[in-house]
Amino acid sequence: SGTTNTVAAYNLTWKSTNFKTILEWEPKPVNQVYTVQISTKSGDWKSKCFYTTDTECDLTDEIVKDVKQTYLARVFSYPAGNVESTGSAGEPLYENSPEFTPYLETNLGQPTIQSFEQVGTKVNVTVEDERTLVRRNNTFLSLRDVFGKDLIYTLYYWKSSSSGKKTAKTNTNEFLIDVDKGENYCFSVQAVIPSRTVNRKSTDSPVECMGQEKGEFREI
């Protein structure tokens, strides 16, 4: 029968950044299609991406309902054109994903320096508070809304003429740092969740330097 050529999905992998969450798997289908189901540990299974020939499924809408829950997904394999058909055990082949807890595991997206302003020997650097796909009361929450004080930013800053990176940290989205008068500085920020054991850091923001458009300089 057609089921003999159906193979189970494998290498099920969660890809998640700022809670945008996609489940990926292998192999590319040959004469078969996939359906994904997702559930919390205590909840019911919900089907997504019905009879797809893709090897990924966007599960963001499900996981943002409660990002602190732990989720499990499974990928079912069906013969193409005969999706009612089942495997030898009387049900379609399927493979389970690893467990996934979005709050603890989603990758932190690359932050962006929104602005910097120099007043005398102080510079105020502001990090953009990125919007996530997590909703509360029909409003999309920012990264800071979701993580609160669990999220900190590390600012790397250096004189344009030197290479050594000084650091500052904040649990808001603003830094106020001391700089030498008459010197131009460059800035890069990194998001960090110190309480995590993995995926603690984001990639660094693009570098912004004084003397470029983003900043404002005021001599006091």
């Epitope: 000084k166 110190p194 054991t197 993995v198 850091k201 660094d204």
Partner: antibody, heavy 120, light 107 residues
Amino acid sequence: EVQLVESGGGLVQPGGSLRLSCAASGFTISDYWIHWVRQAPGKGLEWVGYIDPYNGFTYYADSVKGRFTISADTSKNTAYLQMNSLRAEDTAVYYCARDYGSLQVFIDYWGQGTLVTVSS
Amino acid sequence: DIQMTQSPSSLSASVGDRVTITCRASQDVNTAVAWYQQKPGKAPKLLIYSASFLYSGVPSRFSGSRSGTDFTLTISSLQPEDFATYYCQQHYTTPPTFGQGTKVEIK
């Protein structure tokens, strides 16, 4: 269990070079920051420099700037301190240490230290 | 660079004594101060972080406090294993800096 183990210390002549290693286990160095701190015999603690192994960013104390280089090999989970143009005043026990990376906690784990003696 | 001035440089005390060590920062460091204990031939160990928080596994006889730019480490009742050298450190700005150390000796 978090562990940091330094190696590579020894006796070196003034003007010579030495490379210290800091092998980490129980955590991934790219998720943290690694510092080098030294202590001359009978003296206090002196911060040498740091690296963020995730991006390679570094910063050094003025006393070692231009002579010492901190690097990291994330595939080996190991940080390094390359010391060139060594002077008698660089004689010390060198510790590598893990920076927890939060606003509150700074260095939470230290290695056992390795002794570097600069003498002719 | 921020200077951390620690006092006294040494003190003699008896088991059961209350011991106080002070560190003064040369400028505002908020609460970004840690205290470490070091015994001869050993690496330092974290005792107090963020000026007043006890690190995991550290006995409750150790405490820390802040008043402006002055930081205090207190050992409420000195135990035999507490004879060691204590260092404060600020990590408010780069470079982080240590105090000169306070050696607590047996009277």
